[in-house]
Interface confidence: medium
């Protein structure tokens, strides 16, 4: 073993390195002193360290750590990030699509239902969005709501329009006749299924993402404690006390700090990974009636079909809800049923479909590939920042703790450092109680990313079949019946062009097949129907 | 292009009516709201109400207690707003202007109130 | 009613100089959808007034760079990056959230 180079008398090198942690001079020894008040970077004779110094070098030290950690997290951390926000963005702009699809189905199809159905889609697809971002709204609530309120307007705007206004108190009859007599048949029924169903999947997916942000920066922001800091210090900072500036770490010994270190995160890594492994399960299934782009971008074709079908049964319909609601309204009025054809706007509309572009799928999927390099991420934290650390290549000529060596020995090393403290007992003191909360949150989304894993085969829950759809209905699979049907049927297919779309607002004066342009952005907000938190202003 | 092009100017007695109309074209008159705005000479601007034409919904400034109504003509696209007791400090110009934004602007009715 | 207030009432400006102009709301002006109505005009004198910045801070086709619009919740600005002969007029920040829409003031820019 090399013989130390002889003290530095003056403790010059030590001052001028340690001035770059702390400007001044009052806490170097002008000469190196015996060092009996040190606690960490214990001295085997003169040393150019004070107590002081030890503290600083302490602080320093665990800075240091916390700044490689971030460092260490912040490639996985933005990809979690953008891609939370990029879906996030993404999903709102498939339910505004949905909602503008649907409302330019009404506009095209059936003009005299609106302005009140733009307003009753409206609320649905605002729900739809709150939903989503983790409000706690009901689904098949949502979904009766839509149709609860379109029924009244659908009965006395197409199949009753000789009604009067004074008949008007008959809506809340309506609505429960549209429940009790199923006037939109299975419908209903159907789209609560595909929108619970999808929606749920995007709502954990987006959850999931969330809470691998929380994970990143619970862990991104760790304090690390005095016995870590005392270990980093001896590790990076004793050395200078000896003078000895330019001395690197012993690789192996650096591993052993660092996983003594990192005892309480590297707990996190088996949730990690089941994380990762579940949510890929998750983005496996999130096709058909579990992907909501496919489910909300359909939706319009679904209302469309409903109408038909009560259009279909108007003549019996008209007559039962005479009888039943016939002490809602002065006399009879005559049923005004006209022929399916003439509320079919036969214009088709086309929205672009391009084959190859990027999809949310496609981009789900990249994500979860991309996190999977990442699988290993906790497991792997203490090698990777000794690799991104000074260490000595190798482990030759290097420090360990107490001295220069020619070669790093850990059980040396560990027999050395005896009377300053235990690295296994570090280990055993458990994680963090900020760790302990973030491994329980892991824990609740793989459980609930577990109970979301998609069933294999066919997707629906038999008993639609059983509510007694009409051929025609619906077709075979109500998996697929979401599809557009009718000439006047926007033609949508399940590619939202994910990038592209996300600088593009499209309205329903921007509807497919409309001309209007609207400026600027005009599709934001009404003063009678979207005022948020204001009472309506509607006379 | 999008015009909205407004009746000519008014003298009125207190305790009068006047109406004042708002012609559209350029865009499909129905599917915007039309609001109304004055300013009272050397004074800043005032939001009376709106209409949408589609609807007919409508929607006023509490300020006015009633004394103002909007309404539409579809078939000729053209709004009105109808403000009734006039009194002196009801002088000002009344503006149309198209929701939302109000990226569009009639050139201004000037509506005097005087004995 | 939602009190728009703006600061300064007047503003007098050297040809070339940069301008700013403030506007306060007595209420927070952002949607449940996440946008702030927020606009900005400007009345010429003698016009009607028109539109230069909507939803805090995208300026209106054929609006001039130089203008620039920024804030959120209840504080906005806008600035004129360096003032014109043809930019005096009377600067006004409207709110259209809630019922009844309320406009500031207004801000009389002239030039020194």
């Known amino acids: 073993q090399p013989p130390p180079p002889p003290p530095d008398a003056t403790c010059h090198q030590v001052r001028s390195f340690f001035q770059r942690l702390q400007p001044g001079l009052k806490w170097v020894p002008e000469t190196p002193v015996p060092g009996s008040d040190l606690q960490v970077c214990l001295p085997k004779g003169p040393t150019c360290c004070s107590r002081k110094m030890e503290e600083k070098y302490q602080l320093t030290a665990r800075l240091n750590m916390e700044q490689l950690l971030q460092s260490a997290s912040m490639e996985l951390k933005f990809l979690i990030i953008q891609n939370a926000a990029v879906f996030q963005e993404a999903f709102e702009i498939v339910v505004r699509h949905a909602k503008n699809y649907t409302n330019a189905m009404f506009k095209n199809n059936y003009p005299s239902l609106t302005p009140q159905a733009f307003e009753f889609v409206g609320e649905f697809f605002t729900d739809v969005s709150l939903y989503i971002l983790g409000s706690d709204i009901n689904v098949d609530d949502m979904v009766n709501e839509l149709f609860d309120s379109l029924f009244p307007v659908i009965y006395t705007q197409l199949m009753n329009p000789g009604l009067p206004d004074s008949a008007l108190d008959i809506n809340e009859c309506l609505r429960g006749a549209r429940r009790d007599l199923k006037v939109f048949g299975n419908f209903p029924k159907l789209i609560m299924t595909q929108v619970s169903k999808s929606l749920q999947v995007t709502r954990i997916f987006l959850q999931a993402l969330n809470l691998g942000i929380e994970v990143i920066n619970t862990t991104d922001h760790l304090k690390f404690s005095k016995d870590c800091g005392r270990m980093l210090t001896r590790m990076w900072y004793c050395s200078y006390c000896q003078g000895l500036m330019m001395v690197k770490p012993c690789g192996g010994y650096c591993n052993v700090v660092m996983q003594g270190c990192m005892a309480g995160v590297v707990e996190i890594d088996k949730y990690w990974r089941e994380y990762i492994l579940s949510l890929e399960e998750l983005v496996n299934g999130m096709y058909r009636i579990y992907d909501m782009e496919n489910v909300l971008l359909g939706l319009f074709s679904t209302i469309h079909d409903s109408i038909q079908y009560v259009q279909k049964n108007a003549g019996k319909l008209t007559t039962t809800i005479g009888k039943l609601c016939a002490h809602s309204q002065q006399r009879q009025y005559r049923s005004a049923y006209y022929p399916e054809d003439l509320f079919i706007d036969k214009k088709v509309l086309k929205v672009a479909h391009v084959e190859h572009e990027e999809t949310l799928s496609s981009r789900r999927r990249e994500l979860i590939q991309k996190l999977k390099s990442f699988i290993s991420f906790y497991s792997a934290l203490p090698g990777y920042i000794c690799s991104h650390s000074p260490v000595a290549e190798n482990d030759t000529l290097c420090w360990n703790g107490q001295e220069l060596v020619e070669r790093y020995s850990q059980k040396a090393a560990r027999n050395g450092m005896k009377n300053q403290f235990n690295l296994h007992e570090l280990k055993m003191k458990g994680p963090e109680p900020v760790v302990s909360q973030i491994i329980d949150k892991l824990k609740h989304i793989n459980q609930l990313l577990r109970t979301m894993s998609m069933p294999k085969g066919r997707v629906l829950d038999k008993n639609l079949d059983e509510e007694g759809f009409e051929s025609g209905d619906c077709g075979d699979d109500e998996d697929e019946c979401i599809g557009g049907s009718g000439d006047g049927m926007i033609k949508v297919k399940n590619q939202l062009r994910f990038l592209a779309e996300l600088a593009y607002d499209l309205d329903v004066d921007d509807a497919p097949g409309n001309s209007q342009q609207a400026t600027p952005k005009d599709n934001e907000i009404s003063t009678f129907h979207n005022l948020g938190n204001v009472h309506s202003p509607l006379k | 292009e999008v015009q909205l092009v407004q009746s000519g100017a008014e003298v009125k007695k207190p305790g009068a009516s006047v109406k004042v109309s708002c012609k559209a074209s350029?865009?499909?008159?129905?599917?915007?709201?039309m609001h109304w705005v004055r300013q009272a000479p050397g004074q800043g601007l005032e939001w009376m109400g709106a209409i949408h034409p589609g609807s007919g919904d409508t929607a006023y400034n509490q300020r006015f207690k009633g004394r103002v109504t909007i309404t539409a003509d579809k078939s000729t696209s053209t709004a009105y707003m109808e403000l009734s007791s006039l009194r002196s400090e009801d002088t000002a110009v009344y503006y149309c202007?198209?929701?939302?934004?109000?990226?569009?602007w009639g050139q201004g009715t000037l509506v005097t109130v005087s004995a | 009613d939602i009190v728009m207030t703006q600061t300064p009432l007047s503003l007098p400006v050297t040809p070339g100089e940069p301008a700013s102009i403030s506007c306060r709301s007595s209420q927070s002006l952002v949607h449940s959808n996440g946008n702030t109505y927020l606009q900005w005009y400007l009345q010429k004198p003698g016009q009607s007034p028109q539109l230069l910045i909507y939803?805090?801070?995208n300026r209106f086709s054929g609006v001039p760079d130089r203008f620039s619009g920024s804030g959120s919740g209840t504080d906005f600005t806008l600035k004129i990056s360096r003032v014109e002969a043809e930019d005096v007029g009377v600067y006004y920040c409207s709110q259209s959230i809630y019922v009844p829409y309320t406009f500031g003031q207004g801000t009389k820019l002239e030039i020194k």
């Open positions: 202007a198209r929701f939302y934004s109000y990226a569009y």
């Open positions: 350029g865009y499909t008159f129905s599917d915007y709201e």
């Open positions: 939803k805090v801070s």
